[in-house]
Interface confidence: low
Amino acid sequence: VPRWRQQWSGPGTTKRFPETVLARCVKYTEIHPEMRHVDCQSVWDAFKGAFISKHPCNITEEDYQPLMKLGTQTVPCNKILLWSRIKDLAHQFTQVQRDMFTLEDTLLGYLADDLTWCGEFNTSKINYQSCPDWRKDCSNNPVSVFWKTVSRRFAEAACDVVHVMLNGSRSKIFDKNSTFGSVEVHNLQPEKVQTLEAWVIHGGREDSRDLCQDPTIKELESIISKRNIQFSCKNIYRPDKFLQCVKNPEDSSCTSEI
């Protein structure tokens, strides 16, 4: 008799998830000498332990604490780049500007980037068929709770000037419901963080509007100011040129506004 299985609204666990996590861990620890001490088998066991045999709508931050402990990593607190709805450009930027870090440049963020995972209550099986969708099923699912946990810790670690890259092509440039808007903004520590600097990335080539005046950016400024953190904003009119100038700052065309 086939066992009844809960059907969730979201896609199932990423194919070859255990191998992927282990492979990424090995690659990361071999590239980053400061993380060479990490035992990737233990990391995978802790990752697995956070969600296997647990109801995928009843995951807590506490479930991920053993993994958080194993993945503890010190990044320069004044070199943190947050992002919202513009991950690819943020990652391209930190690949060039190697002294700055997004969450996905840390071990735990790198392990889970673009992956989906969940288990089933009372069985040791990974569910490759479906996993809970944040909106349609439940918010306390393994993936959402993981990103909430690591994002909170990442924001708490930040200091001095924190940068955030925002997508100027979206109807809500700053979205209160994004991970940045709902988690990271509220976990920046005013006693450590002096300024949040937003970089608003323009999509259209002929778009010369000042998107720093957008109502959602003003809303972000208000939230940040109430938390006793200064706010500044820059338009990045030409993201392609922006990246090029990060690569080659001496280029004569890089003195003009980008």
């Epitope: 492979a23 090995v26 990361y28 071999e30 035992d39």
Partner: nanobody
Framework: EVQLLESGGGLVQPGGSLRLSCAAS????????MSWVRQAPGEGLEWVSA????????YYADSVKGRFTISRDNSKNTLYLQMNSLRAEDTAVYYC???????????????RGQGTLVTVSS
Amino acid sequence: EVQLLESGGGLVQPGGSLRLSCAASGFTFSSYAMSWVRQAPGEGLEWVSAISGSGVNTYYADSVKGRFTISRDNSKNTLYLQMNSLRAEDTAVYYCASGKGWDGNTWYEDYRGQGTLVTVSS
């Protein structure tokens, strides 16, 4: 040119042991993680075990943990897989794979040997 040549497969009874070897050439062996993957008849590839370039860290799939041991001899450019307490479900072609040029997502996207057949049967 990268070459990986597996040997040591054969027919063994349930509960028995085998030791697979993989001779590597064409790249700096000690610089790269190596792994074993297997393919049972009519099935997809399954990752079995891996070892870091230095040999310090080892990793195992849950299905073989406690029974298989991966090791390497960087002076001989050779990878090993000691397989104990073999079961019928371990029957497969076993491939040695290099992590050279990983995309970080899988162990065996880059170079893989021709494989050696392990048959566990009474």
